[in-house]
Amino acid sequence: DSSKWVFEHPETLYAWEGACVWIPCTYRALDGDLESFILFHNPEYNKNTSKFDGTRLYESTKDGKVPSEQKRVQFLGDKNKNCTLSIHPVHLNDSGQLGLRMESKTEKWMERIHLNVSERPFPPHIQLPPEIQESQEVTLTCLLNFSCYGYPIQLQWLLEGVPMRQAAVTSTSLTIKSVFTRSELKFSPQWSHHGKIVTCQLQDADGKFLSNDTVQLNVKHTPKLEIKVTPSDAIVREGDSVTMTCEVSSSNPEYTTVSWLKDGTSLKKQNTFTLNLREVTKDQSGKYCCQVSNDVGPGRSEEVFLQVQYAPEPSTVQILHSPAVEGSQVEFLCMSLANPLPTNYTWYHNGKEMQGRTEEKVHIPKILPWHAGTYSCVAENILGTGQRGPGAELDVQYPPKKVTTVIQNPMPIREGDTVTLSCNYNSSNPSVTRYEWKPHGAWEEPSLGVLKIQNVGWDNTTIACAACNSWCSWASPVALNVQYAPRDVRVRKIKPLSEIHSGNSVSLQCDFSSSHPKEVQFFWEKNGRLLGKESQLNFDSISPEDAGSYSCWVNNSIGQTASKAWTLEVLYAPRRLRVSMSPGDQVMEGKSATLTCESDANPPVSHYTWFDWNNQSLPYHSQKLRLEPVKVQHSGAYWCQGTNSVGKGRSPLSTLTVYYSPETIGRR
């Protein structure tokens, strides 16, 4: 069944003398593997022999033997699906029909492939898009219906005979569907490419020319224009005439409309290639161009700047910047419409000519209040001198000047007084709108620039005010010089540095932190009694009787201030010791007797020792010695010793008499 054989390959292959041909081919024989393959050139079926006649280019048999002369033709296929062939080199007389005679065990098939071999390399074919427009990227394609592994070729693009700078992408196809070599070139044509010759050149591996295809590019573009003007420099005076001509150097397709524009705006009723301007005025100065349109769009010429010359117009002054801040820089610009531009300027300040100022700009690097006023100017060019315009006002702004803080009170000011201050200044621009005071306090401002301090403190030393507009100017601080009685009076012990012991030399100092006025007097007092009028109170040898509460007073012309009471403490060893007896120095036996060691000591006695009439110490160490029950044997003289941190003291002897009770006497 012949329908079992399915072949796929290009219908026709193209080559030229001396090149090669590669025939991609696949097949399918359903009944088994290929057993025999013959490649015929122009095969014809012979009905008599039931075989094909024709030149056998290639033959493979079951034993696999191939005649040596068949090396030009190669069967690159296999026994079940690949039937690819190669002929290298290929000759002109190979043109015609190739017949692939295939035989399997039970089936036979003849497959025909057309081969077209030309005498010389045939040209590639350039494919262009249907329309090419300037600045729009296009792809030029060069296609050659040839590709063969054994014969490398290259396609090169030329523009006007010169290799094109743009990189081309070359691709090849050697498939059962198609055989070709293709080069694609992307480029953005400009209007000047219109009419230019593009060539795709086929070359061999060594770059030798084989053939080419050529096209002339048809690039659609907006009209390209040149503008000509008489006079050529486009500089005229008022009343002169000007002619402008618009030339179309290229347009594709043909142009349809013409118009003229001045400063980007279309001029009415000007639709020819010539623009005639008669008796021009200065208003006709500007940038002119012609615009010509075609189906692609409008094209514009370069602009011609028409300058109509005239004498300067009345000038105006522009100030950068007003109001100006004192100390800043200011620039004045004299503006006057004129053509040609003014060459000389005269400047006026408050109507008076400013000497040495002849430039368009006046620059004042450091503005001062006196620079304020009206500035005007006059411009001059070759055609004449302009008029002085209205001028511009320079407002110079500055912080308040000569700010002072003034005390309104009679002097001196005493602590607790109400003080009124005012903030004064000499001049200000803009006006003063507020005031500030230092230091800040909960003070009244009864009116703008006035400060009232109720119950002024002793420590209100200085006050400063600021007058403020856009800026604040501070006055120098003013001293209130508040007078007050001495402050922080206190007693301070100068010597000894440690605690005071009886017999020490002692100095007490009367201290105070401040006093205004400074001249002061001192007074020392103990228990309401005046002791001295010096800043120091001295004791050559202190005695416990000097202990007590001391105060010192400091006074000035404003008043006097007392210190807190200061306690003078004198430390001494126990003294004036005596032994007291309770209930008395005569006690009946069996009763209770308490002996107490009384003393005067600072600090108090910390340790007591009791002695009997034999100066024998008793095992008792408290202040009281309790004898209970008392015995007659306890009779005798007793004394005590007291000890503190300063020293020891002893009492004189005190005699205790213990007498017999009536019971004892009764027993006797």
Partner: antibody, heavy 116, light 112 residues
Framework: QVQLVQSGAEVKKPGASVKMSCKAS????????LHWVRQAPGQRLEWMGY????????EYNQNFKDRATITADTSASTAYMELSSLRSEDTAVYYC?????????WGQGTTLTVSS | DIVLTQSPDSLAVSAGERVTMNCKSS????????????LAWYQQKPGQPPKLLIY???TRESGVPDRFSGSGSGTDFTLTISSVQAEDVAIYYC????????FGGGTKLEIK
């Protein structure tokens, strides 16, 4: 070699039309534009327009766009120029020409005489 | 269109003399892609089509005697015949082909 062979001389009356031909050989006809140039007696050469045989695109000198029609028959490698509404000032020699990158090829010219 | 103005209109020189003729373009004919000036010079004798002498402003066509030379760039071009021969009597045209085609008015060369 490249050759442009033009049709023979023509005599026409004012108001009539004329169609002259230019047969190209020796190159691929569709690869190059074909221009028409005329020269009136004692006058300068005057470009009339061209055709791109590849796509029949034409472009004309503004002076001729209403009266001249350029066409091409690629199968015959021939270009044609028809001029209508003839007037006496159309009396001239009409040339077809084409440019290659480094040269120009001109036909021998067709003489048109317009006379009543 | 680009306008070409030739000067002088005509000139008469003795054989062997050097002659120059000018062609001024209203716009540049320099093509930026290859830096060539798209200007050609032709010689035309009565009853003959124009004969190409120079292309790209300065390249001599093969077969043209080397006494013919072209120069210039942009908008101003010159054709020089270094030693005029009797057979050089003709009208010489300049031709721009950068954009469409335009021709100069021609310069007529005569021998005294």
């Amino acid at each position: 070699q490249v050759q442009l062979v033009q049709s023979g001389a023509e005599v026409k009356k004012p108001g009539a039309s004329v169609k002259m031909s230019c047969k190209a050989s020796g190159y691929t006809f569709t690869s190059y534009w074909l221009h028409w140039v005329r020269q009136a007696p004692g006058q300068r050469l005057e470009w009339m327009g061209y055709i791109n045989p590849r796509n029949d695109y034409t472009e004309y000198n503004q002076n001729f766009k209403d009266r001249a029609t350029i066409t091409a028959d690629t199968s015959a490698s021939t270009a044609y120029m028809e001029l209508s509404s003839l007037r006496s000032e159309d009396t001239a020699v009409y040339y077809c020409a084409r440019r290659d990158i480094t040269t120009f090829y001109w036909g021998q010219g067709t003489t048109l005489t317009v006379s009543s | 269109d680009i306008v070409l103005t030739q000067s002088p209109d005509s000139l008469a020189v003795s054989a062997g003399e050097r002659v120059t003729m000018n062609c001024k373009s209203s716009q540049s004919v320099l093509y930026s892609a290859n830096h060539k000036n798209y200007l050609a010079w032709y010689q035309q004798k009565p009853g003959q089509p124009p004969k190409l002498l120079i292309y790209w402003a300065s390249t001599r066509e093969s077969g043209v005697p080397d006494r013919f030379s072209g120069s210039g760039s942009g908008t101003d071009f010159t054709l020089t015949i270094s030693s005029v021969q009797a057979e050089d009597v003709a009208i010489y045209y300049c031709h721009q082909y950068l954009s469409s085609w335009t021709f100069g008015g021609g310069t007529k060369l005569e021998i005294k």
